[in-house]
Amino acid sequence: LDSPDRPWSPLTFSPAQLTVQEGENATFTCSLADIPDSFVLNWYRLSPRNQTDKLAAFQEDRIEPGRDRRFRVTRLPNGRDFHMSIVAARLNDSGIYLCGAIYLPPNTQINESPRAELSVTERTLEPPTQSPSPPPRLSGQLQGLVIGVTSVLVGVLLLLLLTWVLAAVFPRATRGACVCGSEDEPLKEGPDAAPVFTLDYGELDFQWREKTPEPPAPCAPEQTEYATIVFPGRPASPGRRASASSLQGAQPPSPEDGPGLWPL
């Protein structure tokens, strides 16, 4: 007795597929092709065993609610359309729904709508409302995302802080001496002139020797970066070795030392 799919039905049930979040209302529309004098309109859910469970009904201008008051049938002003709504849908409301009508004597007729599917999905995290409510438990994925974003922000802040500390400890001076050409020749300020940065890296623990550094080679045509290495007038005490963890403050070179410019 399995009837073939019929191309036309005097009852329509739409939408064919409906997805709502849990807690939202889910509304289908059941429409009659015409308005008979006397009829009963029922709303059903298909059980896993393919049995129909009647949810609510409309009969002769009166609504018959089912056992669960969340299922509501409302006749619209045009008389042909009926809203069939689930108030505050739950996850287990997901399933197959349809509407059916019986037109009462003298000509008793049964009509069934096509089936429609409802999917109720889990509620996603919403922005906090003004009313104080306990924050919902974050899902694993979301938690990971929050931790990741926080880590990146902390990393960026640490980098900024490190940059600031380095800038404070090693201030860049725009003045410096160039050993290019003769001593009397002023520094070139043109676009071709390579900028000279004077960087004081604190005290370096060299083996002390009574020897002046060798003069640097003449300027190469390519751009060369220079650093000023300051040699103290006396051997550095063991407690004043420069290291990554104990950087010394910038100390201007004493006149007798003279600037030592070394290409980096």
Partner: nanobody
């Protein structure tokens, strides 16, 4: 052509139960819905219960809602009417009916009927 044959009627005490069956044969593939009507002596035939064959939607007269249950077995081309808490006023000849299309009516085809008598 569709042929319908009822069975399961009989005599029962008030408060008792009966199960009626209606077997369809012939061009059963055209059946869209089936149902039960009854006719008491001196009264008009009245609708009792109906079922849509495709979706299994069910319908009942107010007088039997909650006491009677209609169901179908597609494999056997059979429709059933389980009657519980029977009352003397349920006494009647029960007829099986079939609707052959969306545009048809529940009464396109009729069975011969089966007698149900409920004693007070």
């Amino acid at each position: 052509q569709v042929t319908l044959k009822e069975s399961g009627g009989g005599l029962v005490q008030a408060g008792g139960s009966l199960r009626l069956s209606c077997a369809a044969s012939g061009r059963t593939e055209i059946i869209y819905a089936m149902g039960w009507f009854r006719q008491a002596p001196g009264k008009e035939r009245e609708f009792v219960a109906g079922i849509g064959w495709s979706g299994g939607t069910t319908y009942y007269a107010d007088s039997v809602e909650g006491r009677f249950t209609i169901s179908r077995d597609s494999a056997k081309n059979t429709v059933y009417l389980q009657m519980r808490s029977l009352k003397p006023e349920d006494t009647a000849v029960y007829y099986c009916a079939a609707q052959d299309s969306v545009a048809g009516t529940l009464g396109d085809y009729w069975g011969q009927g089966t007698q149900v008598t409920v004693k007070p």
